[in-house]
């Protein structure tokens, strides 16, 4: 083996040596039949036409042929990994789910971290949230934790997510990123002024996956076995210290090695450094959230330590590579939905949206089976129920048991005790605009009491330079709403985009083509 | 360091209104959320009612509908408008400013007036 080479350059090598007592195996067509020859089709004479009998072909070129499957729609390019969760605190008192036990209980988890808004093929090193979503394997079934890296969110209401995503996406006309759609509706949605900052602060470009905190961001619900419920967040802490890449490297690493956090990833859980994350909750009681001075199922918002301080869980712990990317990291499918008893969903509008959205997302990128799938199948619960049959249905399709419920014929009960925890609701029903639930505070003691002056001279540049792309008038709609934060965040960041503009003139007007018409009004004169 | 001074307190009728104000001796505009805490004779101290420094309000159930949070950041004031007093109402009532550093807002500063007694009695 190379000395010179890391364990994912030697991949290959690596597997070579670990069948090295081994005969290789008998190459097959799907169906498992041997093949004789795999390098030559199938003609009439030397230089004639292919034979539709030649299966050896077809098999191959068919299933090849249907290899891609939709990437995800978000969060496309990441990296996966497994390990362990260990209780190290007892938490019983808030939450009855099996996973929190008893101290030094094990749980297996699967874990994807992942970037937003590139395309599976794109750079690791790209200012953008990453995600960091953890699968437990539960006695109760798989509990997802969907989280980020940051402990917030661009908005707070979910029906703005596909114009959001839209935003950061490719323009549908040039497929090119474009600065207007991005800071004009930021700068339309000033509740994204925190995750903006927090973005492009220094922790906006993580070195690597293993070198960053994780949050489940939203609120949820912990209910003891008593049916005593409070508010939760969750929070996982880097053992390894938090990185981050300067504007410098990163730009270099997403040109010299843009799979950076996957190879990092790899190489390190291959040679033993298992990375880990200490595990955190806050809580917050039903009275507390009468009094705290924000919505506290604001998705925009996080709850201060120091009066919701972080208690301390357990460790999460990654000491396995995947076997096969595709398997068991592509087709992984996280969904904030899974959740076993003793944790429940807040009225966080954002969680409400994704409860719905993660699983209908993987309906369509995996198929309506996609638990069958080895990575998502809660392999640790017994699946009784009274779904059957679809596309793909991978198991024994609960054999002989009824495929209905009631029945007399002692198949699947249901459980008392996994009822959810009831609560009281009253109010009015209608759109709530959330537009102006107070978008600066918790910003302006982020840039006023959290950075320090050369950190905040950072943020400024990082975001004149994002920003000088956009039009004007776009830029104005942004600075104004820095300024509402603090005066210097809004000023420094003028001077800067001063300058910008100053070296490049920019045309004040926005022109497009009206939808609907494929030709601009002087072509169509010279029809 | 924020001194904190309250003024408009004094006795009233039930049914009554009075406008507490709260004056400080420095800029208000990043202090994270100020407050209006009451403490009644023999009782623990309360929370009436919070105002962030981009003005989201809440207010303790038993003053809802009838109690008003403002704060101007400009003037560094803030009012506690009291509307429709009850005798329950009576008390010490405290302005308070706390602000909040570190990521996770994980320490803060924290100020306090010296009080100022409302009394509502017929």
């Known amino acids: 083996m190379a000395d010179s080479r890391d364990p994912a350059s030697d991949q290959m090598q690596h597997w070579k040596e670990q069948r090295a007592a081994q005969k290789a195996d008998v190459l097959t067509t799907g169906a498992g039949n041997p093949v004789g020859d795999k390098l030559n089709v199938i003609t009439v004479g030397p230089r004639g036409p292919l034979l539709v009998q030649d299966v050896v072909f077809t098999d191959e070129m068919a299933h090849f042929d249907r290899e891609r499957i939709p990437e995800r729609v978000v969060h496309a390019k990441g990296a996966g990994a497994f390990g362990y969760f260990e209780v190290t605190h007892d938490i019983t008192k808030y939450s009855k789910a099996k996973v929190f036990e008893h101290i030094g209980k094990k749980t297996p988890i699967a874990v994807r971290f992942s970037t937003v808004a590139g395309e599976s093929g794109s750079a690791d090193t790209v200012r953008d949230p990453r995600g960091f979503a953890v699968k437990f394997y539960t006695e109760d079934g798989n509990w997802d934790l969907v989280g980020n890296n940051t402990p917030i969110f661009f908005i707070r209401d979910p029906i703005l997510f596909p114009s959001f995503i839209h935003s950061q996406k490719r323009n549908p006309q040039t497929h090119l990123k474009d600065p207007d759609m991005v800071w004009d509706f930021w700068s339309l949605r000033p509740e994204s002024l925190h995750q903006v900052s927090f973005l492009f602060s220094d922790r906006g470009i993580p070195d690597g996956h293993r070198h960053m905190n994780g949050y489940g961001s939203h609120t949820f619900k912990l209910v003891n076995a008593n049916g005593e419920a409070v508010y939760c967040k969750f929070h996982y802490k880097t053992d390894q210290g938090i990185k981050n890449l300067s504007v410098e490297d990163a730009a270099r690493l997403s040109q010299e090695d843009p799979d950076y956090g996957i190879r990092d990833l790899f190489n390190a859980i291959a040679t033993g450094k298992y990375p880990s994350w200490t595990f955190y909750i806050q809580v917050m009681t039903f009275n507390q959230a009468e009094t705290f001075p924000f919505n506290p199922f604001d998705l925009t918002k996080v709850w201060p330590h120091k009066d919701y301080p972080l208690i301390p869980v357990g460790k999460l712990v990654l000491n396995r590579n995947p076997v096969n990317y595709f398997a068991e990291v592509e087709q992984i499918a996280f969904d904030p939905s899974n959740m076993p008893p003793g944790i429940e969903a807040s009225p966080d509008k954002m969680l409400q949206g994704r409860l719905f959205a993660y699983p209908d997302t993987h309906r369509h990128r995996l198929g309506p089976n996609y638990l069958h799938i080895p990575v998502n199948c809660p392999y640790r619960a017994r699946v009784a129920n009274y779904q059957r049959d679809g596309p793909m249905c991978m198991q024994d399709n609960q054999g002989g048991a009824p495929n209905y419920y009631p029945n007399s014929f002692g198949a699947p009960e249901q459980q008392p005790s996994a009822l959810e925890h009831s609560i009281q609701y009253s109010g009015e029903v209608r759109r709530f605009n959330t537009a102006n639930d107070d978008n600066v505070t918790q910003v302006r003691a982020f840039y006023v009491n959290v950075l320090n002056e050369e950190q905040r001279k950072r943020l400024c540049e990082n975001i004149a330079g994002h920003l000088k792309d956009a039009q004007i008038f776009i830029q104005k709609k942004a600075v104004k709403n820095f300024t509402e934060v603090h005066p210097d965040y809004g000023s420094h960041i003028q001077a800067l985009l001063d300058k910008y503009n100053a070296e490049k003139p920019k045309n004040a007007i926005h022109t497009f083509v009206q939808s609907g018409s494929h030709l601009a009004a002087r072509e169509k004169a010279n029809l | 360091q924020v001194q904190l001074v309250e003024s408009g307190g004094g006795l009233v009728q039930p049914g009554g209104s009075l406008r507490l104000s709260c004056a400080a001796s420095?800029?208000?505009?990043?202090?994270?959320?100020m407050a209006w805490y009451r403490q009644a004779p023999g009782k623990q101290r309360e929370l009436v009612a919070t105002v962030t420094s981009g003005g989201a309000t809440n207010y303790a159930n038993s003053v809802k509908g009838r109690f008003t949070i403002s704060r101007d950041n400009a003037k560094n004031t803030m009012d506690l408008q009291m509307n429709s007093l009850k005798p329950e109402d009576t008390a010490v009532y405290y302005c308070n400013a706390e602000d909040y550093y570190d990521y996770g807002l994980s320490r803060s500063k924290i100020y306090w007036g010296q009080g100022t007694q409302v009394t509502v009695s017929s």
């Open positions: 420095a800029s208000i505009f990043s202090i994270y959320v």
